[in-house]
């Protein structure tokens, strides 16, 4: 099939980094300095991408592959191959048009990026909260009531063991 | 219609200096993406110098960086490229050339001129 197609297409021939050049009798011509070409067989190259402002270049452009950007410290990437770069927060905030604002009670956020999200309910899996929750952290739920029946395991410190001689009240 | 001229070409031993020149018309190279690319015998054609976003930036070969430099007039409408500490493997038909940008985003270039003979030999 590929012989096939390169007899009856001649730019089927021209390797990544080239583009097949129609005013040339179809030769394969490399491509302009800042694009590339990254399939053979194209009939132009393509633009490199350019790394400006927020972002910055993580990976250069070459003749046979695109550039590749990230972000610039204090934001982070968005998008399929950080095609937009959003500022981050500390954690216990989140971004809102008017910038970063802190996490409202019953709500947290443990990374730079994101929206703030609720604590966990424990008393929809029957729980008790063992630790409380903060902006920065998600409540932790405690054993359920069940939990702590005899016999059952419990994830509570066992109680100090008694002096000899004392009984209980 | 846009035409390329250069001229500047010739016979030069290795270590020596030569300076191609290209009057260029039907466009203006002010506002265009202009270099060079050669052809040296049996090889494909390669990009050697451009000047990119309208004088912004430079492209140089790694090959050439350091002893070769293209510059403009803009008054005479002409492309240059100064070579020097010349060696064997510059041999080549050099081409002035201009970047195509096409609309629906793909890049190619012309080079419609013959080119110009460098032949660096002891």
């Known amino acids: 099939f590929e012989r096939t197609r390169s007899l009856q297409d001649p730019c089927s021939n021209c390797p990544a980094g080239t583009f097949c050049d129609n005013n040339r009798n179809q030769i394969c011509s490399p491509c302009p300095p800042n694009s590339f070409s990254s399939a053979g067989g194209q009939r132009t190259c393509d633009i490199c991408r350019q790394c400006k402002g927020v972002f910055r270049t993580r990976k250069e452009c070459s003749s046979t592959s695109n550039a590749e950007c990230d972000c610039t410290p204090g934001f982070h990437c968005l998008g399929a191959g950080c095609s937009m770069c959003e500022q981050d927060c500390k954690q216990g905030q989140e971004l809102t048009k008017k910038g970063c604002k802190d996490c409202c009670f019953g709500t947290f956020n443990d990374q730079k990026r994101g929206i703030c999200r609720p604590w966990t309910n424990c008393s929809l899996d029957g729980k008790s909260v063992l630790v409380n929750g903060t902006k920065e952290r998600d409540v932790v739920c405690g054993p359920s009531p069940a939990d702590l029946s005899p016999g059952a395991s419990s994830v509570t410190p066992p109680a100090p063991a008694r002096e000899p001689g004392h009984s209980p009240q | 219609e846009v035409q390329l001229l250069e001229s500047g070409g010739g016979l030069v031993q290795p270590g020596g200096s030569l300076r191609l020149s290209c009057a260029a018309s039907?466009?203006?190279?002010?506002?265009?993406?202009v270099g060079w690319v050669r052809q040296a015998p049996g090889k494909g054609l390669e990009w050697v110098s451009a000047i990119l976003d309208r004088g912004g930036s430079t492209y140089y070969a790694e090959s050439v960086k350091g002893r070769f430099t293209i510059s403009r007039d803009n008054a005479k409408n002409t492309l240059y490229l100064q070579m020097s500490s010349l060696r064997a493997e510059d041999t080549a038909v050099y081409y002035c050339a201009r970047v195509v940008y096409h609309a629906g985003g793909g890049v190619t270039y012309d080079y419609r001129g013959q080119g110009t003979q460098v032949t660096v030999s002891s």
């Open positions: 039907g466009f203006t190279v002010s506002a265009e993406d």
